[in-house]
Structure formats: structure tokens, C-alpha cells
Amino acid sequence: SSSPTSSASSFSSSAPFLASAVSAQPPLPDQCPALCECSEAARTVKCVNRNLTEVPTDLPAYVRNLFLTGNQLAVLPAGAFARRPPLAELAALNLSGSRLDEVRAGAFEHLPSLRQLDLSHNPLADLSPFAFSGSNASVSAPSPLVELILNHIVPPEDERQNRSFEGMVVAALLAGRALQGLRRLELASNHFLYLPRDVLAQLPSLRHLDLSNNSLVSLTYVSFRNLTHLESLHLEDNALKVLHNGTLAELQGLPHIRVFLDNNPWVCDCHMADMVTWLKETEVVQGKDRLTCAYPEKMRNRVLLELNSADLDCDPILPPSLQTS
């Protein structure tokens, strides 16, 4: 998920006098913005850890890889990267860790070649539904995005303004069906409690989906059926208790899939029988020999692959008349 980079020795820093001398004129084609490093040979501009509060206006037209990490951007307004002439070559944009809390509709408009976008490690309390689609039409022009990295974008709990964070993110992913070509989606470390059921069906080109380190309890209402190209599904470090038959069958039906399930609190009772049977037969789960029970207490740390049906019992539920106080 990282973009190509170039060695620091090939970068030229902007001269302060140059920046001020041309501030009132259109940018020169090979100009480097103040506080950035530029390599025309590598088509790369790095404005990293410079406390920038706005996207530089004078980005060179040749830029293909733009790193704007570790800044103080706060807001990405509409057309934040719109330039005349446009940044027609810009393919990889990394905005991680730049204290963004608001991304407005059309923030990435006029970037016809943008394939990789990384917004990780920004507390996105206000992500417009039209941040990626650019318009509120029911069907927007297709986005060129192929890779969207949204790891750890959840704001602090008291800053979510009583809205569903999952819902806000999914609205941005689905608006206008603009992201039909998306192949990689990373949503790790976002405290997701659930995955809205329609999200995957509308991202049919996905090859890699990372949902690790969330708080997903169940996949019962999530369908993977349409994701025929899916190659990797990361579900490590969630709160999954069991995978049911429907999910198991759908995963087994995906031709290229590898699933990662480590570090979930599996509940090894009678409901786990189907999953254990499936695990013993399937090749799709990576590191399946590492999966262990968390509950009930008597089963803690037992390896799932070593269980048999006799191990997987459920305590009988007494009818109300037989229950004692």
C-alpha cells in the first residue's frame, strides 16, 4: 500500500527567495513548493512533517507521487488539488497523520489519474458522503481510485456527534457508485462494531479487504458472494465468536481467497461445530492451526483444529418453571 519513493539525495529543496519571488505568478513547471522536497526524475514531491496548514498551491505539474504526511491540514476543501493546468499525472497521494478532521465533497476532484489514496491516522469526524465521488448524483463519473487506505481514521468516541461512524464511512464508499473499480480497501483499527450489509456488494472489484483490529462481533448479515476477485480478507483482532454456515459457504466459494482470522475470541460451544468441520477441510484460512478458543472458560486456549463434536456442547437452557432463583 506504499507509493514509490526516491532517495533523499535526488531531491531539491525549494529556495525561500524563489517561493516569495513567484508567489504572485503562476507556478513554474519545475518549481518546488516551500517546505517541500521535489524530484522531477522520480516524479515525487514530499512535504513531510512540516506543519503545513493547507495543501501547497504551487505543486509542480509533473508530480506523480505526493506525500503530505505529518502536517496540520485539518480540512480538505472541495477541489483541494484542483490546479490549472490540472495535476494530470498525480497517481499516489498520501495524507496520513495530517490531523485532518474534515474532508469535504469533491476534495479529490480534478485528479484524473489518482489511483492510490491514503488518509490513515486522521480523526475523520466529518467525511462527506461525496468526498470520493465528487458529486451528489445517484451515479457519478467513475473514480480512478484503485487503492483506498483508511486505517485508524476513527475520531475519539466523544467526537462522533451521535452519528454512526460505520455509516458515515460506508456512505462515502458507496456514493454515486464511483468506486466500482476499487481493488484494495483498508479499514483497519476503526472500532467498527458491524459492517453495513450493502457495502461489499457494491465494491465488486475488490481484491484485498482489511478489516483487522476492529470490534466486529458477527458476519451473519455480510455477503461475500459478489466478491469473486477477492484474494485477501483480513479479520484478525476483532470480536468474532463464530462463523456460521452461510458465511463459510460463501468464503469457500471464492476462487482466490485467503482469510486471516487470528486473535478473535472464538466461542467453542455447540454453535462452533460447523466452523471446526470447515476449518479442518478448507485451505483458505491462513494460519488456521493458530486459532484457539477464548470461551467458555473450560475451553480456553484449546486449538480449534483439535476439537471434535464431543468437545462442543451447549449447556441446556432450563425452562422457566425449572429455573431456581
Partner: nanobody, 122 residues
Framework: QVQLVQSGGGLVQAGGSLRLSCAAS????????MAWFRQTPGKEREFVAA????????RYTDSVKGRFSISKDNAINTVYLQMNSLKSEDTAVYYC???????????????WGQGTQVTVKP
């Protein structure tokens, strides 16, 4: 409308320090940015520093960079301006402000504190 109540300020020798506080009566979700401005007689209010409530992004006018520091305490809806290495040209009435934008113009801010005098003796 949110009420902004300022405290701090006063008279200080050049090279000294002061801390200003600005407490919001409630945390307005519509006001995403808190800022400090200053004004000297006959001049327009000048932007000094700003901070975002959520992301904590900060920005400063060039003349105070490295000397002033803006911070916030979300739990008590309060913003601070720590002013070090004060110069006589920092003498002004300082105002805190709340607004939606991530801007440096006073028109970006809708709610204002009452102002507090800072005087730096040469």
C-alpha cells in the same frame, strides 16, 4: 450562540511569559476551530493562532511561531494561549474566537470573547 469567557493577561516585562485562557460555555459542534486574535488601536484584528477541537491541528501567524503555543482541553471546553519570549510589539487586546472554518480571517469566526489586555514593557 456560545459564550466565550477569557482570563489571564496583564502587564509583563519583555522576555517574560503569560498564559491566556478561553472557556466556552458549551462545546458547540458547529464551531470546529478555536482561535486567538489581537488588536491594537486603529488597526484591524490580527490572527495569532488557531486549534481544531477534534484533530488538534494548530496554526500560527509567522511573527509568533516558536514563541506562542495554542492548546486545548476538550474535557472542560477550554483553549489556552501560552505566550513566551514576549516582545513590546505583542502588546494588544487579545480575543478568543470560535468558528467553523480553518481560516485566519476574522470573518471566519462567529463567536468572540470579551477581550483581555496584554501589555509588554520594554
Amino acid at each position: 450562540q456560545v459564550q466565550l469567557v477569557q482570563s489571564g493577561g496583564g502587564l509583563v516585562q519583555a522576555g517574560g511569559s503569560l498564559r491566556l485562557s478561553c472557556a466556552a460555555s458549551r462545546r458547540p459542534f458547529s464551531s470546529k476551530t478555536m482561535a486567538w486574535f489581537r488588536q491594537t488601536p486603529g488597526k484591524e484584528r490580527e490572527f495569532v493562532a488557531a486549534v481544531r477541537w477534534i484533530g488538534g491541528a494548530t496554526r500560527y501567524t509567522d511573527s509568533v511561531k516558536g514563541r506562542f503555543s495554542i492548546s486545548k482541553d476538550n474535557a472542560i471546553n477550554t483553549v489556552y494561549l501560552q505566550m513566551n519570549s514576549l516582545k513590546s510589539e505583542d502588546t494588544a487586546v487579545y480575543y478568543c474566537a470560535a468558528g467553523q472554518a480553518w481560516g485566519t480571517k476574522f470573518t471566519d469566526y462567529s463567536d468572540w470573547g470579551q477581550g483581555t489586555q496584554v501589555t509588554v514593557k520594554p
